[in-house]
């Protein structure tokens, strides 16, 4: 019979098999950002360098408007890496009545848009509490994680404080994902 | 018609299909590393472990001298654990006229060398401030992405002090790439 | 001869090909931990949402009392973030005649445990100090890495203390694997 | 106990070569670097360098790269030194320690081994 | 090349409280792995007293301690006794994860 060398061992019935290299990919890298206004408690949304450098997106994955837009419903592996730096964080010194402060954070969330769906979903989050005592500091958070998505969802990062990400160097900081 | 089965139901013209299992792939664990002198301005590049414990390389994908070998162009997933580990920084103690010092840091970078190419081209960077007030601190670094790489592309991990690299387990010091 | 479109151009002898779509692959995320007895010197294992949210088991994958159970040999991609949150470590105040004491520390351990050998395996760590002078801290620990698993073989993530887990969302403590 | 019994006292000529047993008990000898350093009469402590019994990798202090090696036999949980074109200012007591491995101090020290270098 | 800069000799009289220092001239001395000092009585192998700075390994005398300052570490032992003259070494690694030895302190007991 024809085929039968592709047919595994146990006799599994398989979804149509495809080629690798034409699954939708995409490795977005950072870019300054410009200024946007953005609601007191809702976190801005990164956009991205897309072609230039070590950025693409290919077969049919295609960035636009600081979102990724997922062309075939399957299960991806997404990740993002944001290298924050700042000043000293004053929590540890400006004491009330002996009380230390709330901590300074910084998060960065990976948000899924569906948009026959009202409220976005945060897929993954990565939060951390910064409290230096060196007079400038800096820390990458990284994520990465699988899930299924459907044809038509949008994904975006989110910042906490996007005048702390490092947008020097396209190796600090980025977004992607790929059809697994 | 034969093969029709193969067929994925949007009728793209794909590349050829290849199994999973014959793809390159490398998981490389860390060793104590030999006392070398390396040039002051220079990260140095660790060696791996590529054969004994948890590392392995398959498929045409080797190991030599500090790098990893690509066999053949595609997309690849690249990641590396760096945990790093000292006794306390002083970064927080000492100070100039009270203004503390600029923090010691510790940073991991994934190196792509191209034969063609005259410069090694940074993939990846995850640099961190280390001002530790406590006696010893230990902290691991990750990263990871998709890279589109060449034929004969060659892969490595530098960093910033290889003395402060934690040797003592292969689980908490790690190098990896695989072809999607 | 039909089947030929398949074959890769270097006509090398391949593993039976299989879609992706149904490999065994698993997200599972954080719930609230039942308090349960572990021994001191063992760190204790976390379970785990399988199937709510964002969480899913799919492809033989299977969820079971703290592990996911490897259904198929080959080669899979693990990761686990882990977010830790607690109040002020004291370990840079508290001084035994001048010295430093040791610092606090988080761990997460990703472990195979295989039934045909008597001592697990740590495949993954990611451990670091913890001294903060704010007054509350958070941060994850974050692993991910590729592995050759034996079908039968069972993964566990390992924490240092149970109690230090952030298990308010799920987009901040999970667990995957997927074959690669 | 965790044991490092080493060989007898040797005496070699000037641009011989000279090797060095030590073997331990008392652990698992694949899981601790073991390092050797020497003493010349009258002087300091010196480093030679490490060896993992494990994968056989070893790191070689600057001074001795080219003239020492370091195996190790797991069969008999015995660690090796060899050190070549001997000079009468290798003359010195031969010593190999056990790590710690988090801090890489010598925990645990063989009684030593004298190596003299005479024509 | 780094070094380890010990005093050559040191003295006390029993019960008193002796201290030697260990001044690195490269500021990446011990910074991954810290300073470990060793003893070294008269025809015997040496024995880790102090390792990473400050700690004693289990069946060490809590008569002898370790302490840093900026780049220098010190070993203090108080209450002396008759026999712990000796030798006595620092120890650490330098940024090439090459271990460098002081060149010792002679620690003689008065009396």
């Known amino acids: 019979l024809k085929g039968q060398e592709f047919a595994p061992s146990h006799q599994q019935v398989y979804a149509p098999l495809r080629a690798d290299g034409d699954k939708p990919r995409a490795h977005l890298t950072v870019v300054r950002q410009t200024p946007t206004q953005h609601f007191k408690n809702q976190f801005p949304a990164l956009h991205w360098e897309h072609e230039l450098g070590l950025a693409f997106t290919k077969n049919r994955m295609n960035y636009t408007n600081k979102f990724l837009l997922i062309p075939e419903s399957g299960d991806y592996f997404i990740y993002s890496q944001v290298t924050f730096r700042g000043m000293t964080s004053e929590c540890s010194e400006i004491r009330q009545a002996g009380r230390p402060n709330k901590p300074d954070s910084i998060t960065v969330v990976i948000t899924k848009v569906t948009d026959s769906y009202p409220e976005p979903t945060q897929l993954l989050m990565g939060t951390k509490s910064v409290c230096e005592v060196g007079s400038n500091w800096f820390q990458p958070i990284y994520l990465g994680a699988m899930f299924s998505l459907q044809e038509g969802d949008k994904l975006m990062v989110n910042v906490s404080d996007i005048s702390l990400v490092d947008y020097t160097k396209e190796d600090k900081t980025f977004f992607g994902a790929f059809l697994l | 018609l034969k093969g029709q089965e193969f067929a994925p139901s949007h009728q793209q013209v794909y590349a050829p299909l290849r199994a999973d299992g014959d793809k390159p792939r490398a998981h490389l664990t860390v060793v104590r590393q030999t006392p070398t002198q390396h040039f002051k301005n220079q990260f140095p590049a660790l060696h791996w472990e590529h054969e004994l414990g948890l590392a392995f390389t398959k498929n045409r994908m080797n190991y030599t001298n500090k790098f990893l070998l690509i066999p053949e162009s595609g997309d690849y997933f690249i990641y590396s654990q760096v945990t790093f580990r000292g006794m306390t920084s002083e970064c927080s103690e000492i100070r100039q006229a009270g203004r503390p010092n600029k923090p010691d840091s510790i940073t991991v970078v994934i190196t792509k060398v191209t034969d063609s190419y005259p410069e090694p081209t940074q993939l990846l960077m995850g640099t961190k401030s280390v001002c530790e007030v406590g006696s010893n601190w230990f902290q691991p670094i990750y990263l990871g992405a998709m890279f589109s790489l060449q034929e004969g592309d060659k892969l490595m991990v530098n960093v910033s002090d290889i003395s402060l690299v934690d040797y003592t387990k292969e689980d908490k010091t790690f190098f990896g790439a695989f072809l999607l | 001869l039909k089947g030929q479109e398949f074959a890769p151009s270097h006509q090398q002898v391949y593993a039976p090909l299989r879609a992706d779509g149904d490999k065994p692959r698993a997200h599972l995320t954080v719930v609230r931990q039942t308090p349960t007895q572990h021994f001191k010197n063992q760190f204790p294992a976390l379970h785990w949402e399988h199937e709510l949210g964002l969480a899913f088991t799919k492809n033989r994958m299977n969820y079971t009392n703290k592990f996911l159970l490897i259904p198929e040999s080959g080669d899979y991609f693990i990761y686990s973030q882990v977010t830790f949150r607690g109040m002020t470590s004291e370990c840079s105040e508290i001084r035994q005649a001048g010295r430093p004491n040791k610092p606090d520390s988080i761990t997460v351990v990703i472990t195979k445990v295989t039934d045909s050998y008597p001592e697990p395996t740590q495949l993954l760590m990611g451990t670091k100090s913890v001294c903060e002078v704010g007054s509350n801290w958070f941060q994850p620990i974050y692993l991910g890495a590729m592995f050759s698993l034996q079908e039968g073989d069972k993964l566990m993530v390992n924490v240092s203390d149970i109690s230090l887990v952030d298990y308010t969302k799920e987009d901040k403590t999970f667990f995957g694997a997927f074959l690669l | 106990q965790v044991q490092l019994v080493q060989s007898g006292a040797e005496v070699k000529k000037p641009g011989a070569s000279v090797k060095v047993s030590c073997k331990a008990s008392g652990y698992t000898f694949t899981s601790y670097d073991i390092n050797w350093v020497r003493q010349a009469p009258g002087q300091g402590l010196e480093w030679m360098g490490w060896?993992?019994?494990?994968?056989?990798?070893?790191g070689y202090a600057q001074k001795f790269q080219g003239r020492v090696t370091m195996t190790a036999d797991r069969s008999t949980s015995t660690a090796y030194m060899e050190l070549s074109s001997l000079r009468s200012e290798d003359t010195a007591v031969y010593y190999c320690?056990?790590?710690?491995?988090?801090?890489?101090?010598?925990?645990?020290w063989g009684q030593g081994t004298l190596v003299t270098v005479s024509s | 090349q780094s070094v380890l800069t010990q005093p050559p000799s040191v003295s006390g009289a029993p019960g008193q409280r002796v201290t030697i220092s260990c001044t690195s001239s490269?500021?990446?001395?011990?910074?991954?792995?810290?300073v470990h000092w060793y003893q070294q009585l008269p025809g015997t192998a040496p024995k880790l007293l102090i390792e990473g700075y400050y700690n004693r390994p289990s069946g060490v005398p809590d008569r002898f301690s370790g302490s840093k300052s900026g780049t220098s570490a010190s070993l203090t032992i108080t209450g002396l006794l008759p026999e712990d003259e000796g030798d006595y070494y620092c120890q650490s690694y330098d940024g090439t994860l090459s271990a460098l030895f002081g060149g010792g302190t002679k620690l003689t007991v008065l009396g």
């Open positions: 060896l993992n019994p494990n994968s056989g990798n070893t």
């Open positions: 490269s500021s990446d001395i011990g910074a991954a792995l810290g």
């Open positions: 320690a056990r790590e710690v491995p988090e801090t890489a101090a010598f925990e645990y």
